[in-house]
Interface confidence: low
């Protein structure tokens, strides 16, 4: 059980007071962390409070200003990036956000040695990616899709691709697809360690389907947005490597790396590339049914001036029971020898757990093991391994930081954070810096969330670099809820849950219920970490009990939870929530005519399938931008879970799975549906079909809809969105306003 | 579950040879890390030597190359030879397995364990 900060004296209880909507809208309680931008060894840099660019040095304890914050302004700069030979500055303005990673911005080069901005060939506006080298100060940057190479930053730029154009061909950059469902990035370029090689990706969305939807601005007449989106079972992008030599970037230009023969026999994705030296690099390649992933290690031909992937330096990983691996497939970590690497994959129990791959998979050496998984490896060296884990006294929803001693053999465990901030902190992400000389450990909770600087040897605090006083001190009179996170144990399922129960919690009471409800494959909900949100003012000062509850397709409890979703979605996914409410009304707390579902996006579908269960569980509920059928979802995504809608694979599961199929059965419920008309990702298109369903159904229900918004439903329409769906809850539930 | 029963362990003068075996019964023996503990009245068990599924071994410093562990999957059994023995090697020796990957030379890493055979090493 967490049990938030609270007090029992009465005295003190009349000062208290409860969180209000206006708190959470205006993110009153809102904490900090601090991340180093490492720099060295042992230098990092930050950016003050007042923005200047502050640069600490951890060994002298000296840190001093490389860059004003006059400077900053100058140029209305929001962003920065200091090169490797720290001879010069980036400085990024004219933020533009496009989709969820990439945005454009304008860049100016700052030189440090002279204090003045680089004057002739400057960089054009405005920019989809640009980035130092790193070594040195050449720079490489994409423009109208195509890539450019700066030798120096006052240097006019070779152009290295010329067949960029807006829709139909990306180099260096994602397309919609990618950025979102495989790269997880807004960049498809890659330096090699040095900076003697440039790696890059080039998609080309020549023969995809385009999602066109009306974005209404202000003009007499909308303008369209157009996207190449493959839907499942759609054409999907096209796309190749290619590495090309940037210090003679013209001798023989742009060459391609071959892709594996197994994966080229049929579709398929790029996955992912590391440099491991600057003459080999890793390419990773995943079938269009993705459950075969090809691991390639691919080295330089000084000769042909060419790269070659030998066959014996390919490794498979295939899955029988799922798809191949978590969310994403790991990416390796490689040791000191430049051929071995460490990976995080199932083991033969079905738990994801860090291996050492030296010459084939089948002979990988298990490095973890247990019922239990790892999570990430953040860093190798010498003789230490760095990963996390939610090994420690067996809760998933934790995350640890563990260093295994690899330089002596065998090797010896230590779990870094057990025993740091036991009942503050159990859930940690790690920086390191270069060689992990230092690191930095940032707690997420369960209590106020906290940054400490670590010495990299020996483990021990050097400092904490945020603490969220100023947090803690707002907090002191507010009535926060408790959370306790426990599990229920189901026909064979373990069912973690957490429960936010209101400050006064009495279990002799009846209190109204809502679950919160994302549930999709490799998500999970309850973990042991700080907020103060929505959720939170709900139980706090409406009364309301809260669940989440982690079922059948979540992560980091092993492959046989996870994969039981496994080309059924909407499935499990429904049946663990609504085994789970059935349990909690056995606790003997909860008003069995006040229970309410509520879910964004994966969770919208959740809980418009639960509402339209047939149960007669649930009084009322939301979904926010919901995926309705996973024909109108994203190629990469779906078919990851579900296999193709085609009639010889998957399609009967389509067409089984929709909401739309369901529409009679909301006609005992009541149901807000709500949606942005500018949603690029669960498109619009989604809710005006359930929309359309139900009016054909003759059943009645409430709905929103948000102008030219996004997925995120952001700025002024998060107030409006949180405040309608607190009236439609209080409605729902009898509470007075 | 897995069952570890040692054989082999008695009484041997200084500088003789000694085969210890180590038969398991249950589930798949093959998948499993296993190893030789000895420990002395007073002291911590300490791992003498362990061998992976894949056959990689591990050695404590100490044994400069006397001992050598190996295992036959075919007949689930695990072997310690055990060459010019000294009155130091005097112990009850315990066969241990842990599921999973990994040579752990901490006793808190394997999961099943033997009830041990004592060997003891005489002038």
């Known amino acids: 059980i967490v049990l938030r900060p609270s007090r029992v004296h009465n005295s003190e209880e009349n000062t208290m007071r409860a969180l209000t909507l206006k708190d959470i809208l205006n993110g009153t309680f809102s904490y900090k962390t601090f991340f180093p931008n490492w720099i060295s060894g042992q230098e990092y840099l930050h950016q003050s409070a007042d923005n200047n660019i502050v640069l600490y040095n951890i060994e002298t304890g000296q840190s001093y200003t490389i860059l004003s914050n006059r400077t900053m302004k100058s140029v209305n700069a929001s962003n920065y990036g200091l090169s490797p030979d720290r001879q010069f500055v980036y400085l990024e303005s004219d933020y533009s956000k496009l989709w969820r990673y990439s945005y454009t911005a304008t860049y100016y080069i700052y030189d440090l040695s002279n204090g003045e901005f680089v004057r002739g060939n400057e960089l054009p506006r405005p920019i989809q990616y640009l980035c130092w080298s790193p070594v040195g100060s050449k720079l490489a940057y994409v423009y109208q899709n195509n890539i450019y190479l700066k030798q120096r930053p006052g240097d006019p730029p070779f152009q290295i691709t010329f067949n960029g154009r807006e829709n139909k061909i990306f180099n260096g950059i994602p397309d919609w697809v990618y950025e979102e469902e495989m790269l997880a990035t807004k960049y498809a370029l890659w330096w090699s360690p040095n900076g003697k090689f440039l790696a890059y990706a080039e998609f080309n969305d020549t023969d995809i389907p385009v999602i066109a939807y009306s974005y209404y601005g202000d003009e007499q007449y909308p303008r369209t947005i157009n996207i190449p989106y493959p839907k499942a079972g759609a054409k999907n992008p096209v796309v190749r490597i290619f590495i090309i030599d940037t210090t003679y970037p013209a001798y023989v230009g742009p060459q391609e790396v071959p892709v594996p023969a197994m994966i080229a026999s049929s579709d398929y994705y790029f996955s992912w590339l590391t440099w491991v030296t600057d003459e080999r690099v890793c390419l990773q390649w995943l079938k269009r049914v993705q459950n075969v992933s090809v691991l390639s290690i691919c080295d330089f031909r000084e000769d042909w001036q060419t790269w070659d992937c030998p066959k014996t330096q390919e490794h498979i990983e295939e899955s029988r029971t799922g798809w191949a691996g978590g969310f994403f497939v790991s990416t390796p970590v490689f040791s000191y020898d430049a051929i071995s690497y460490y990976k995080i994959f199932s083991d033969k129990d079905g738990y994801k757990h860090i291996h050492y791959i030296k010459d084939t998979v089948e002979n990988a050496i298990q490095i973890t093991s247990g019922k239990w998984e790892a999570i990430n490896i953040f860093r190798v060296t010498q003789d230490s391994l760095f990963y996390s884990s939610n090994e420690f006294e067996e809760y998933p929803g934790r995350r640890n930081i563990y260093r295994i001693s690899i330089g002596s053999y065998p090797p010896s465990k230590k779990c870094v954070t057990c025993h740091l901030r036991k009942e503050r902190c159990q859930y940690y992400t790690a920086s390191f810096s270069d060689y992990a000389k230092y690191y930095a450990l940032v707690c997420y909770g369960p209590g106020i969330p906290i940054s400490t600087l670590h010495d990299g040897r020996t483990d021990q605090e050097i400092k904490i670099l945020e603490e969220n006083k100023e947090l803690e001190n707002a907090l002191k009179n507010i009535q926060l809820p408790k959370e306790e996170i426990k599990k229920l144990e189901v026909d064979e399922i373990t069912l973690w849950y957490k429960m936010i129960l209101p400050p006064q919690f009495d279990r002799s009471k009846k209190y109204p219920l809502l679950i919160q409800v994302y549930g999709g494959p490799c998500s999970q909900s309850v973990r042991s970490v700080f907020a103060v949100n929505w959720i939170s003012y709900l139980a706090s000062k409406e009364g309301m009990v809260i669940a989440l509850v982690d079922g059948r397709g979540t992560a980091f409890q092993g492959d046989k939870l996870l994969y039981a979703v496994y080309r059924k979605l909407g499935v499990y996914e429904v049946e663990d929530q609504i085994t789970a409410v059935r349990k909690f009304i056995e606790m003997g707390f909860i008003d069995e005519k006040r229970i309410a579902i509520w879910g964004w996006s994966y969770g919208g579908y959740v809980s418009s399938l639960a509402l339209a269960s047939g149960t007669g569980l649930f009084k009322c509920g939301i979904a926010v931008a919901p995926v309705s059928s996973w024909e109108y979802y994203a190629s990469v995504y779906t078919e990851r879970f579900m296999g193709l809608p085609t009639k010889d694979d998957n399609l009967e599961h389509y067409k089984n799975s929709t909401v739309m199929a369901r529409a009679e059965y909301f006609r005992n419920v009541d149901y807000l549906l709500i949606h942005g008309t500018a949603d690029d990702n669960v498109h619009f298109q989604n809710s005006a079909q359930i929309a359309k369903a139900l009016v054909n159904a003759q059943v009645d229900f409430q709905a929103m809809w948000y102008s030219d918004q996004n997925h995120g439903l952001s700025g002024l329409s998060t107030n409006h969105l949180y405040t309608h769906m607190t009236h439609f809850l209080k409605q729902c539930f009898s509470l007075s306003d | 579950q897995v069952q570890l029963q040692e054989s082999g362990g008695g009484l041997v003068q200084a500088g003789d040879s000694l085969r210890l075996s180590c038969a398991a019964s249950?589930?798949?023996?093959?998948?499993?890390?296993m190893g030789w503990f000895r420990q002395v009245p007073g002291k911590q068990r300490e791992l003498v030597a362990a061998?992976?599924?894949?056959?990689?071994?591990y050695y404590a410093d100490s044994l400069k190359g006397r001992f050598t562990i190996s295992r036959d999957n075919a007949k689930n059994t695990m072997y310690l030879q055990m060459n010019s023995l000294k009155l130091e090697d005097t112990a009850v020796y315990y066969c241990?397995?842990?599921?999973?990957?990994?040579?752990?030379?901490?006793?808190?890493?394997?999961?099943?364990w033997g009830q041990g055979t004592q060997v003891t090493v005489s002038s």
């Open positions: 249950g589930r798949t023996f093959s998948s499993y890390v």
């Open positions: 241990a397995a842990r599921e999973g990957g990994g040579i752990w030379t901490s006793s808190t890493q394997y999961d099943y």
């Open positions: 061998i992976t599924s894949g056959l990689s071994t």
